[in-house]
């Protein structure tokens, strides 16, 4: 039978009892947290043959081997890795060897072997006939082989009984336990599977089969399992199903899913059953079970419970990542924050639709409303008192809405308010009103001409640039002499760049009122001659790269309750010039015959311009006489080079370090000192088991319930 | 964990109705696939009917197809069969049962399992 999908046994080992009747299992299998030491020894699930995704156990106490609970596991898919392992073995205090006798393959994923104080025979399974590739296989922390003692069967009678191969240059015995040996086939096989008579099994078999040849035979499939025969790829009108079965359309139809968003059940798309529709896919109508790309990012609704989302942070923006229909009304409340423009975008940059009302008041952190960058449509569903669904009161530094020459917003129903926004030019707020659609609806006291862009500079001559001059890390520009009609009023210019790979920046891009700001800026003074145009040098430049400029002239902003005028120029996009890349990296070079040298590399990580070749030079070097000062062989004549283990916790010190062999002169010698990069991959791999143990406790430990 | 307690069961004459209940503590029941299942004496365990996590998709077996119905309240944290035009061979242990993620048509081993509870239908 098949179960699943996915089996969690925690806390009571009495929970096993649900493996009965299960040949496979269709997910994962834990087994965890159970405290109290049992005897496992009456619990046994030989029908087990298949985890399709992959096996963790953490903390069972008690249980010594796992070749009693499940002698014949035979394959372990890895469809669904946990952090990239297939099989997890992490703090079992007990677990004396693992004993899987039967498990043959692991199709994907790597092994992670850790914390296990009593675990043994680990030196003794080559895990390179049961995984691809054990590069990735992490196994830390365990019983010191040296305090094991592992002996396979027959060693101790001198009747050896298990089969050898070659690990890390050491050719041994392979065996799961004291008595039981690892399987391995005949080279006549190649990748096949075999029987326990060593008879290879069809190719479709995966891990082992009953009878030599016959893809109804097998214990699990390599590929695809349908109606008791084991297929290269799933037939006509039938679906891939967790990465292992064929399924009809009826099948799919009917799969019922406990999430609570289930009105549509599951999916067919590209030839596999899936629960939703993969990403930049939705479904061809709410009924339907089949997936058409999304135009643009796909929809998602998000609801708010109280009707209106408050934001008052980046923690309450995090919340809305990824939407695009917002049910509700948005409250936006932004006083301080940290890089908060580009953190708003990043959380709320996909919001397209709004149902009910915007209230953006006291946000004196926002400079723009750009973050809304896909707003498109305000419903007023639900508007303020006063029948208001956009409301804009008290932002001190909220100098622009958004850039209207690219954007299009509506707003349906409902009318707009601006007041106390000093810095908030009423022409962007007419503009706003001609593009929403809101002309005439608003009364004369809903936007208040006085207070709204009082401390602005509203009226805004262009500034020309006059020229520019560019090579590989410097820009020179000027521009225009700015002339007000009244002289003092001008004080400075400011010049904005910043790098632009795309014709597609705006002023306010990621700027916000508590300093950030994604624009570089520099001060230019007046140049004291009134005929000599203003200018600057930008200068620490990458070559190569495109930066957008602007300039803006920093002018008084009041006279006498007047607005005056200020000045800006238009962004200009420019290029620095090409210059010199940096080197080719990861340079390999192998010789596949006595003629010929194959050289490989990858690009340098600054071309600083566009690559046209590349020069390969190469020269004829001297032999290597050290090549000609050993008898190779001589097993003896070989200097002896002994490296650490990389066993973790406990560092043992059980012999003189004075009397080591180093570099093939005899003689005391103290243990090197560590490299920085040595002790850099330590730090790392000390990292890394951090990481790997908070996800693990992340995963699986759930709060209890109220 | 999860536990699981049916009630609602008795003697009922053919042609009649009753209503199985089945309430879940140890866990809210939205996050999980439930299912009624049924074993008549000296027979296997047959499926009867199961239901989605949001209440909006169920699945009958043939043989009951029109006759029942299944339903659930999760905030109320019960599963309710409602059980119409009953005949002599819907007699059985009526098995309420829970799985978590999705349950596909052919999973017989769901997760948690209630004691059962009795239905008689008889002249």
């Known amino acids: 039978e098949i179960c699943g999908p996915g089996i969690d046994i925690r806390n009571d080992y009495q929970q096993l009892k649900r493996l009965e009747n299960c040949t496979v299992i269709e997910g994962y299998l834990h087994i965890l947290l159970i405290s109290k030491a049992e005897d496992y020894r009456s619990y046994r699930f030989p029908k087990l043959t298949v985890i399709t995704e992959y096996l963790l156990l953490f903390r069972v106490a008690g249980l010594e081997s796992l070749g009693d609970l499940f002698p014949n596991l035979t394959v372990i898919r890895g469809w669904k890795l946990f952090y990239n392992y297939a099989l997890v073995i992490f703090e079992m205090t007990n677990l004396k060897d693992i004993g899987l006798y039967n498990l043959r393959n692991i199709t994907r994923g790597a092994i992670r072997i850790e914390k296990n104080a009593d675990l043994c025979y680990l030196s003794t399974v080559d895990w390179s006939l049961i995984l691809d590739a054990v590069s990735n296989n992490y196994i830390v922390g365990n019983k010191p082989p040296k305090e094991c003692g592992d002996l396979c069967p027959g060693t101790m009678e001198e009747k050896p009984m298990c089969e050898k191969t070659t690990i890390n240059n050491e050719y041994n015995y392979r065996c799961w336990t004291t008595n039981r040996c690892q399987k391995m086939c005949p080279s006549t096989c190649g990748k096949r599977a075999c029987t326990e008579n060593n008879e290879c099994c069809h190719p479709e078999c995966l891990g082992s089969c009953s009878a030599p040849d016959n893809d109804t035979a097998c214990v699990a499939c390599r590929h695809y399992y349908y109606a008791g025969v084991c297929v290269p790829a799933c037939p006509p009108n039938t679906y891939r199903f967790e990465g292992w079965r064929c399924v009809d359309r009826d099948f799919c139809a009917n799969i019922l899913s406990a999430e609570s968003s289930d009105s549509e059940g599951f999916v067919i798309h590209d030839g596999e059953c899936m629960q939703e529709c993969p990403s930049g896919f939705i479904r061809n109508g709410s009924q339907s079970m089949y997936c058409i790309p999304c135009e643009g990012p796909c929809p998602k609704v998000c609801e708010e419970e109280k009707k209106t989302k408050t934001i008052d942070s980046v923690t309450s923006a995090q919340m809305l990542q990824g939407c695009t229909i917002f049910k509700g009304n948005l409250l936006i409340n932004i006083r301080r924050g940290n890089n908060i423009a580009s953190e708003l975008e990043n959380f709320m940059g996909l919001i397209e639709v709004v149902t009910g009302y915007v209230k953006i008041r006291h946000s004196h952190a926002l400079v723009s409303l750009s973050f809304l960058k896909n707003l498109r449509l305000i419903l007023g569903e639900e508007q303020l008192e006063g029948n208001y669904s956009f409301y804009v009161l008290d932002n001190q530094n909220l100098q622009q809405l958004w850039d209207w020459d690219h954007r299009n917003l509506t707003i349906k129903a409902g009318k707009m308010y601006f007041a106390f926004n000093p810095k908030l030019c009423v022409s962007e707020i007419y503009r706003m009103e001609e593009v929403t659609g809101t002309k005439g609806r608003q009364s004369k006291g809903d936007i208040n001409t006085r207070n709204n862009g009082e401390r602005a500079s509203c009226e805004s001559d262009v500034l020309h640039f006059t020229s520019t001059t560019t090579s590989k890390n410097r820009i020179i520009i000027t521009w225009h002499r700015y002339r007000p009609p009244d002289y003092r009023d001008l004080i400075s210019f400011t010049v904005y760049y910043k790098e632009a790979p795309f014709k597609n920046v705006t002023e306010y891009d990621g700027q916000d009122a508590c300093g950030s700001n994604s624009w570089n800026m520099v001060d230019v003074d007046l140049p004291p001659n009134k005929d000599v145009e203003p200018g600057i040098l930008l200068h620490g430049l990458k070559p190569w790269t495109q930066y957008a400029v602007y300039v803006k002239a920093v002018t008084l902003t009041m006279v006498e309750n007047d607005h005056i005028r200020g000045a800006k120029s238009e962004i200009l996009y420019i290029r620095t010039n090409a210059s010199v890349p940096s080197i080719p990296l990861d340079v390999l070079s192998a010789s596949n015959s006595s003629s010929q040298l194959i050289v490989k590399w990858n690009p340098p990580s600054l071309p600083n311009g566009n690559l046209s070749y590349y020069i390969v030079r190469w020269q004829r070097q001297p032999q290597d006489g050290y090549l000609y000062r050993h008898n190779y062989c001589s097993k003896d004549k070989i200097p002896i080079r002994k490296y650490a283990d990389g066993t973790i916790d406990i560092e043992e010190v059980t012999e003189n370090p004075k009397t080591e062999v180093c570099g093939g002169e005899k003689g005391p010698c103290c243990a090197c000192p560590k490299t920085e990069a040595e002790k850099q991959a330590e730090k790392e791999e000390a990292e890394y088991r951090k990481v790997f143990e908070n996800f693990l406790h992340n995963s699986i430990f759930v709060p209890r319930p109220e | 964990e999860v536990q699981l307690v049916e009630s609602g069961g008795g003697l009922v004459q053919p042609g009649g109705s009753l209503r199985l209940s089945c309430a879940a503590s140890g866990r809210t029941l939205s996050s999980f696939v439930m299912a009624w299942f049924r074993q008549a004496p000296g027979k296997g365990l047959e499926f009867v009917s199961a239901?989605?996590?949001?209440?909006?998709?169920?699945r009958y077996a043939d043989s009951v197809k029109g006759r029942f119905t299944i339903s659930r309240d999760n905030s109320k944290n019960t599963l309710y069969l409602q059980m119409n035009s009953l005949r002599a061979e819907d007699t059985a242990v009526y098995y309420c049962?829970?799985?978590?993620?999705?349950?596909?048509?052919?999973?017989?081993?769901?997760?948690?399992w209630g004691q059962g509870t009795l239905v008689t239908v008889s002249s």
């Open positions: 049962a829970a799985n978590p993620r999705y349950a596909t048509p052919d999973l017989t081993q769901y997760a948690y």
């Open positions: 239901i989605s996590g949001s209440g909006l998709r169920a």
